[in-house]
Amino acid sequence: QERRFQLEGPESLTVQEGLCVLVPCRLPTTLPASYYGYGYWFLEGADVPVATNDPDEEVQEETRGRFHLLWDPRRKNCSLSIRDARRRDNAAYFFRLKSKWMKYGYTSSKLSVRVMALTHRPNISIPGTLESGHPSNLTCSVPWVCEQGTPPIFSWMSAAPTSLGPRTTQSSVLTITPRPQDHSTNLTCQVTFPGAGVTMERTIQLNVSYAPQKVAISIFQGNSAAFKILQNTSSLPVLEGQALRLLCDADGNPPAHLSWFQGFPALNATPISNTGVLELPQVGSAEEGDFTCRAQHPLGSLQISLSLFVHWKPEGRAGGV
C-alpha cells in the first residue's frame, strides 16, 4: 500500500552539462514521527534506484558517486544532489520511502530534470597591461562550477613563454612573460569536466605593450617609386627642385609617436613635423644635411637618420618668362 505526496517547488529543473543541481524534497508532514525506513530516488520506469541510503540496495552504475540522497528525517529532508550532470540524466525522477516494519510506504510526485548543453565559458582575467619582458599572472576561472563536482582540468595554449601557477577547483593561474612578437597572438584556456566529458574554452588576443623594435623610412622622390631604408644612411642623393616625401614607420604597441627633426636632435628639440610624414615640396641645395625620425614610446624610443645630398641637373632650372 502506497501513500502519495507532492514534491514542493517546480515540476522541472534545468542544469547544464557538467554542473550540479539540487532536486528539493521534503518528507510529507503526515509522516508519523515513529516511521522508520529508507529513502530511494528512482528514474521513472526503473526499479533500481539512482540514489539511496539503504546499505543493502544497489544503485545504478551510471549514477553511482554522482547522485546522492541528502537524508535528514529530523529536518524532513529527502533532497537529491546531482553533480557532474550528463545528457543521459535528462529524465523524470521520483522519491520513495519504504519501511520493512511498516505496511505502507510513501511515493512522491515526479520531477523532470532537463540537462542542457553547457553554455558557460571560462573567464580569463589579466591584471593591468601585458608588458614585453615582464611576467604577468593570467587567471582562468570557472566561478559557476560547483565545489562538490569533480574538479575540472585546466589547460592553456599560447605561443608566448609561460609557466603554470597555483590552481583551485575553480581557477588556474598562468604566468606569462610576453615578447613583442606575441602581440595579437591567441591565448586559450581550455576547461574539461571529466565527470561529464565536456570541454569548454575561451580564447583571447594578447595585447602586449612593447617599445619600438624597428624603424624605417620610405622615400618618395618626384614620380619615382618609393624605396625603404632600415638603418642610418649617409649621402642619399636627391634631385634639387623635386618634391620629396619621407615616410617614417615604426612598430611598437601602443603605436609610437613619430616625429621628424633636422640634424641629430637633443631630447628636448622641436620637431619639424609631429607625424611620421615629412614633406619637402621643393628640395633646395641649402637644405642638404641630416634628418632624423624619432619613434617615441613610454617603454623606450628609437630613431633613424638619413643624410640628403642634393644634386642638380644643369638644364633643370626655370628660366625667365
Epitope: Q282, S285, A318
Partner: antibody
C-alpha cells in the same frame, strides 16, 4: 629680411586679363615653392595652387584650372598670377605666399593685391 | 576634398582671458595643420605648424594642440593686439584647404 612685395590694386572689366606680380627678396628664390591664395571680400582663404620655383612646374587646385596661370621670372625673383577672361566673381584680394620648406603650409605672405572686376 | 570646419564664426573676449579656437577636419589629417592670424587690412601670418609647433617669433601665449580630426588654438592671456581673424589649414592631402575662420572681438 624675407619679403614678398605684390603689385598694386587692379580695376578690370569682365572679359579682360590681369597679371599680378610677387617680388621675393631675402632668401634663395629657387629653394621655396610659391603659392597663391584667394580671399573674396568678407570671406575665408582659398588655396589656388603653387608653382615650383626651381622647375617652373605649376600645380592648380581644381577650382582654378583653365583661366588661371602661374609663371616665374627667376632672374627677377618674381612670381606671377595671370587671370584671363575675368569674371565678377574674381573680385578678391590675391596673396602670394611662400611654401614652407617642410610642408605645404605658408611661412611668408605678400601684402595682397586687390582685384576688382566690374562693368 | 577635406573640409576644415571652424564652427565659431565670432568670439568675444576681454584682455587677459584664455581663448580657444576649434577646428574640425572632415577626415584624419594627422598633425598636418597650420594656424594663421590675419589682422584687418593685413596678410595672414603663420602662428602654428604641425598642429602644435609655434613658428619662430610667435609669442608663447599661442599654443596649438590636437591630432587626427580635432584641433585647437589657444591664446592663454589675450592681448589687444591679438584681435584678428584666425584660420586653420590642413596640408595633409591635396587640395590644401582652410577653415572659414573665427573673428576675435572685444566684449
Amino acid at each position: 629680411q624675407i619679403q614678398l612685395v605684390q603689385s598694386g590694386p587692379e580695376l578690370k572689366k569682365p572679359g579682360e586679363t590681369v597679371k599680378i606680380s610677387c617680388k621675393a627678396s631675402g632668401y634663395t628664390f629657387t629653394t621655396y615653392g610659391m603659392s597663391w591664395v584667394k580671399q573674396a571680400p568678407g570671406k575665408g582663404l582659398k588655396w589656388m595652387g603653387w608653382i615650383n620655383t626651381y622647375s617652373g612646374v605649376p600645380t592648380y587646385a581644381d577650382d582654378f584650372k583653365g583661366r588661371f596661370a602661374f609663371s616665374l621670372e627667376t632672374s627677377a625673383t618674381t612670381a606671377y598670377l595671370q587671370i584671363n577672361n575675368l569674371k565678377n566673381e574674381d573680385t578678391a584680394t590675391y596673396f602670394c605666399a611662400r611654401l614652407a620648406y617642410f610642408g605645404y603650409y605658408f611661412d611668408f605672405w605678400g601684402q595682397g593685391t586687390t582685384l576688382t572686376v566690374s562693368s | 576634398d577635406i573640409v576644415m570646419t571652424q564652427s565659431q564664426k565670432f568670439m568675444s573676449t576681454t584682455v587677459g582671458d584664455r581663448v580657444s579656437f576649434t577646428c574640425k577636419a572632415s577626415q584624419n589629417v594627422g598633425s598636418a595643420v597650420a594656424w594663421y592670424q590675419q589682422k584687418p587690412g593685413q596678410s595672414p601670418k603663420l602662428l602654428i605648424y604641425s598642429a602644435s609647433n609655434r613658428y619662430t617669433g610667435v609669442p608663447d601665449r599661442f599654443t596649438g594642440s590636437g591630432s587626427g580630426t580635432d584641433f585647437t588654438l589657444t591664446i592663454s592671456n589675450m592681448q589687444s593686439e591679438d584681435l584678428a581673424d584666425y584660420f586653420c589649414q590642413q596640408y595633409s592631402s591635396y587640395p590644401y584647404t582652410f577653415g572659414g575662420g573665427t573673428k576675435l572681438e572685444i566684449k
